[in-house]
């Protein structure tokens, strides 16, 4: 399980691998703060609501973010 409430940062382990944008329920980008010194990306999957922590430094994840924002901009009027 990548999530924990016992540490300042939410993510314990992070993945460099992208997920299918169509499988995403929600994608949260949590900026670095006084509580956690790094940006965290938390993907909530449609299937079972499983949460995954993604590495914001990974090129594959950056490509995923681009794809998601492109999809969103298509949907917005």
């Amino acid at each position: 399980v990548p999530l924990s409430r016992t540490v300042r940062c939410t993510c314990i382990s992070i993945s460099n691998q992208p997920v299918n944008p169509r499988s995403l329920e929600k994608l949260e980008i949590i900026p670095a703060s006084q509580f956690c010194p790094r940006v965290e990306i938390i993907a909530t999957m449609k299937k079972k609501g499983e949460k995954r922590c993604l590495n914001p430094e990974s090129k594959a994840i950056k490509n995923l973010l681009k794809a998601v924002s492109k999809e969103r901009s298509k949907r917005s009027p």
Epitope: Q17, V19, E57, S58, A60
Partner: antibody, heavy 119, light 107 residues
Framework: QIQLVQSGPELKKPGETVKISCKAS????????MHWVKQAPGKGLKWMGW????????TYADDFKGRFAFSLETSASTAYLQINNLKNEDTATYFC????????????WGAGTTVTVSS | DIQMTQSPSSLSASLGGKVTITCKAS??????IAWYQHKPGKGPRLLIH???TLQPGIPSRFSGSGSGRDYSFSISNLEPEDIATYYC?????????FGSGTKLEIK
């Protein structure tokens, strides 16, 4: 050393199913996504999609939705490509390729599996 | 999808000579281009990534350059083992696309 070893050539009839394998060694299988690439005879390389090796979730390029299925046997560090209801136009060499996701490109390739579809 | 237009489709050059292959993307790919050498019966071999970064073990006879939409790949001091087909790949996108390939022959 890091390598991807693919299964041998296949000769199939139209309508049949083929399942080809790609066995990884020399690295942690679940650390990198696995992609599949098609090369039809006399043609160039065409990306088919990928499978997330941590979750087993496949993603298919638009031209490969429907009859194509990516799967894993994580305990054996093996990825599979299955093609159902084979057509003549599926005759090709299929490559598996590891993606170095952190930087985004394919850094290790299998030698390819030739699938021939002929009645 | 991003299209990659690769040229020429084939070329012939002399041993010791130099060849250049170009790839033009249909939009800015931010230098995220890789170059591969492909020989029959083998998997493609990564030569260069991020436009100009040589993979470990690849001789400095191979080089790449470019930015925006326009990229080039060169081989100098051609050797017999360079006979192969070369492909560019853009990876600035979740949907990967290859160039159509350039078949290199030695005169």
């Amino acid at each position: 050393q890091i390598q991807l070893v693919q299964s041998g050539p296949e000769l199939k009839k139209p309508g049949e199913t083929v399942k080809i394998s790609c066995k990884a060694s020399g690295y942690t299988f679940t650390d990198y996504s696995m992609h599949w690439v098609k090369q039809a005879p006399g043609k160039g390389l065409k990306w088919m999609g990928w499978i997330n090796t941590e979750t087993g979730e496949p993603t298919y390029a638009d031209d490969f939705k429907g009859r194509f299925a990516f799967s894993l046997e994580t305990s054996a560090s093996t990825a599979y490509l299955q093609i159902n209801n084979l057509k003549n136009e599926d005759t090709a060499t299929y490559f598996c390729a590891r993606n170095y996701d952190y930087d985004g490109y394919f850094d290790v390739w299998g030698a390819g599996t030739t699938v021939t579809v002929s009645s | 999808d991003i299209q990659m237009t690769q040229s020429p489709s084939s070329l012939s050059a002399s041993l010791g000579g130099k060849v250049t292959i170009t790839c033009k993307a249909s939009q800015d790919i931010n230098k995220y281009i890789a170059w591969y050498q492909h020989k029959p019966g083998k998997g493609p071999r990564l030569l260069i990534h991020y436009t100009s970064t040589l993979q470990p073990g690849i001789p400095s006879r191979f080089s790449g350059s470019g930015s925006g939409r326009d990229y080039s790949f060169s081989i100098s001091n051609l050797e017999p083992e360079d006979i192969a087909t070369y492909y560019c790949l853009q990876y600035d996108n979740l949907l990967f696309t290859f160039g159509s390939g350039t078949k290199l022959e030695i005169k």
